[in-house]
C-alpha cells in the first residue's frame, strides 16, 4: 500500500557519534499508531532490540554509535486505522574530524555544524543539542572553543545544556563544540556537537530571532475544542537557534508525554533573501480547564513569546 510522503530531512553527521532521530507527525502520532523504521531499500524493519547498535526505540531510530556504512535513506512509516504517512531521513555519515591535525585547531570544518549567534555587548547563550530517548542518560557536558576546553568563570558559565556567554565581544565568535557522555544499557558514548558562532550587533529594540506571532496575547477558546496555534519566527539564515514550545519551562512533548493531548508540530520554513521564516505549531487536541490561564511559550534562541488560553466571554446580547 502507498504512503503519503510528508517530509525529507537531510542530516550530515560525523561517524562515532551516537545519533537519534525522532519520528513525529502530530496529530497522527498522538493516537494509536503503528510506527516502523526501515532503511531503504530493505523491506525488513529496523530491529527494536535495544542491545543492537542500530535499533528502534519507541518513535526513535537510534545509532549507538554511527558508522560510515550507516549512510543512506531511512523511512519512518506511520500507520493508523485509516492512513499511512512516511517521513524520510537522508543520512550522510562523514569521517570523524574532532580537532585532527588537518583542521588547524578548529573543530568545525564540516557541514555537520550548528550555526548560532551571540549578541555583541550583551549576554547570550549557546545550546548543546541533546535530544535522545528516555533510555539514554546524558551528563558531563563540556564546552570547547577551538579545541580548548572552556572553564566556568566570569566570561562563560555552563548551565544544563546551555553555555552562557557574558558581555559578548566580536572575538567570542568562532568555532565551538560541546560534548556530553551518553549512557545506554550500561555502555558509554561521547556526543560531540560542533557550533559555528557568529557575533552580531543587535538592532535596538528588536531581537534576533524575531517572533512575529504570538505576541504574549490571549486566545479565547471553548472548553473541549481543538486548537492549533502557529509560532512564526524570522531568523537570519546563518543561525540555528532552537525553536520549540514550552509549558512550565518544559518542552510540551515532554510535559504531555503520557497523554499526548498537546503536542508540538513539525517545523516548516520558507527561505527569504537573507532570512528564513519558520513556523512551528502547537496542537491542543482537546482544551481542558487546566489549560486556561497557563502560558504556552514559543522559544527561539534568546526570544520567547507566549499565548494564554482564556475561557470565551459569554455573549449576553
Amino acid at each position: 500500500d502507498t504512503c503519503e510522503d510528508i517530509f525529507m530531512h537531510n542530516v550530515i553527521i560525523s561517524e562515532g557519534q551516537p545519533f537519534p532521530f525522532n519520528c513525529t507527525y502530530p496529530p497522527e502520532t498522538n493516537g494509536a499508531v503503528n510506527l516502523t523504521w526501515y532503511k531503504t531499500p530493505s523491506k525488513s524493519p529496523v530491529s527494536n532490540n535495544r542491545h543492537l547498535r542500530v535499533h528502534q526505540d519507541q518513535t526513535w531510530i537510534l545509532f549507538l554509535p554511527l558508522t560510515l556504512e550507516d549512510s543512506g535513506i531511512y523511512q519512518c512509516v506511520i500507520r493508523n486505522a485509516h492512513n499511512c504517512y512516511q517521513i524520510a531521513v537522508n543520512l550522510t555519515v562523514l569521517k570523524n574530524h574532532w580537532c585532527d591535525s588537518s583542521m588547524e585547531g578548529s573543530p568545525v570544518n564540516s557541514p555537520d555544524v550548528y550555526q548560532q549567534i551571540l549578541p555583541i555587548g550583551k549576554s547570550g547563550s549557546l545550546n548543546c543539542h541533546l535530544y535522545f530517548p528516555e533510555s539514554c542518560a546524558l551528563d558531563s557536558i563540556k564546552w570547547y572553543k577551538g579545541c580548548e576546553e572552556i572553564k566556568a568563570g566570569k566570561k562563560y558559565s555552563p548551565s544544563g545544556a546551555k553555555l552562557l556567554v557574558n558581555n559578548v565581544a566580536v572575538e567570542d565568535g568562532g568555532s565551538y563544540a560541546c560534548s556530553a557522555r551518553l549512557t545506554h544499557l550500561g555502555r558509554h558514548f561521547t556526543i560531540r556537537n560542533y557550533i559555528a558562532v557568529n557575533t552580531k550587533e543587535v538592532e535596538y529594540g528588536r531581537r534576533i530571532p524575531n517572533i512575529t506571532y504570538p505576541k504574549n496575547n490571549s486566545i479565547e477558546v471553548p472548553l473541549g475544542s481543538t486548537l492549533i496555534v502557529n509560532c512564526n519566527i524570522t531568523d537570519t539564515k546563518e543561525n540555528t537557534n532552537l525553536r520549540c514550545w514550552r509549558v512550565n519551562n518544559t518542552l510540551v512533548d515532554d510535559y504531555y508525554k503520557d497523554s499526548k493531548r498537546i503536542q508540538e508540530g513539525i517545523e516548516t520554513n520558507v527561505s527569504l533573501r537573507d532570512q528564513i521564516r519558520y513556523t512551528v505549531n502547537i496542537t491542543f487536541l482537546k482544551v481542558k480547564m487546566e489549560d486556561y490561564g497557563r502560558p504556552f511559550t514559543c522559544h527561539a534562541g534568546v526570544s520567547a513569546a507566549y499565548i494564554i488560553l482564556i475561557y470565551p466571554v459569554p455573549d449576553f446580547r
Epitope: C128, L130, E134, A137, L138, D139, S140, I141, P158, S159, G160, A161, S179, A180, R181, T183, G186, H188, T190, N248, N249, T250, L251, D254, Y255, K257, D258
Partner: antibody
C-alpha cells in the same frame, strides 16, 4: 538560597505504605534530577533512583524496583517517594538530593532527611 | 554493581596533622579522561555534604584543606591540616554507572 525541605518523621505498621515529600526552592526545579538515597541506622548510603522533572523519566536501582515509586508535582516544585509493603528493613532515614541535568554527576544539595520507622 | 571499599573504616588524627582516606572501586570509574568519583562528609544527624566531585574538584565553599586525587580504581581524600570541625564520616560515591554506589564510610576522630 537552594533548599530541599523534606516531610516529617513517619511511624507505620508493617505491610503499610508511606509517601514522603521533598519541596525544592531557590532554583529552577526542572533543571535538576531529584534523587533519593536511603541510610539505615549505622549503615552506608544506598541510592534508590531519580526522577527527571524535565521529561518525566525515572531510573531505579534494581533493588528498589517494586518498593519505591518516584513522582513529582512540577507546579509546587515537589518530589515524592512512595514506599510500599513496608517491613522493618525499610526503617531508615531517606534523603532527597539534586543533580544538575546534563551537566553534573554529583549531589550538591541534600534535604534534611525523613526518618521512617516500621514497627508493629 | 560497582563496589566501593573504603579504608580505614575509622581513624584518629591529631589536630593539624594529615588525614588520608582511601576508596577502591571494583572496576574503573574513568571515562573519556574523567573520573566519576565524588566525596561527601556527614556529621551525626545531618545529611551528607559534597566536598569533592570528579575525583579532584573542590566544591564551592569547601576549605582548601580538603583535596582529592586518583583515577581508575584508586582514589584518595586528604585533609590537611585537620581541624576540630572535621570530625565526621567520609564517604566516596561513584557516578560512573547506575546503580550509583557509596563506600561504607570512614569515621574520622580528632585526637
Amino acid at each position: 538560597e537552594v533548599q530541599l525541605q523534606q516531610s516529617g518523621p513517619e511511624l507505620v505498621k508493617p505491610g503499610a505504605s508511606v509517601k514522603m515529600s521533598c519541596k525544592a526552592s531557590g532554583y529552577t526545579f526542572t533543571d535538576y534530577n531529584m534523587h533519593w538515597v536511603k541510610q539505615s541506622h549505622g549503615k552506608s548510603l544506598e541510592w534508590i533512583g531519580f526522577f527527571n522533572p524535565n521529561n518525566g523519566g525515572t531510573r531505579y536501582n534494581q533493588k528498589f524496583k517494586g518498593k519505591a515509586t518516584l513522582t513529582v508535582q512540577k507546579s509546587s516544585s515537589t518530589a515524592y517517594m512512595d514506599l510500599r509493603s513496608l517491613t522493618s528493613e525499610d526503617s531508615a532515614v531517606y534523603y532527597c538530593t539534586r543533580q544538575e541535568i546534563y551537566y553534573s554527576n554529583y549531589f550538591d544539595y541534600w534535604g534534611q532527611g525523613t526518618t521512617l520507622t516500621v514497627s508493629s | 554493581d560497582i563496589v566501593l571499599t573504603q579504608s580505614p573504616a575509622s581513624l584518629a588524627v591529631s589536630l593539624g596533622q594529615r588525614a588520608t582516606i582511601s576508596c577502591k572501586a571494583s572496576q574503573s570509574v574513568d571515562y573519556d579522561g574523567d573520573s566519576y568519583m565524588n566525596w561527601y562528609q556527614q556529621k551525626p544527624g545531618q545529611p551528607p555534604k559534597l566536598l569533592i566531585y570528579a575525583a579532584s574538584n573542590l566544591e564551592s565553599g569547601i576549605p582548601a584543606r580538603f583535596s582529592g586525587s586518583g583515577s581508575g580504581t584508586d582514589f584518595t581524600l586528604n585533609i590537611h591540616p585537620v581541624e576540630e570541625e572535621d570530625a565526621a564520616t567520609y564517604s566516596c560515591q561513584q557516578s560512573y554507572e547506575d546503580p550509583y554506589t557509596f563506600g561504607g564510610g570512614a569515621k574520622l576522630e580528632i585526637k
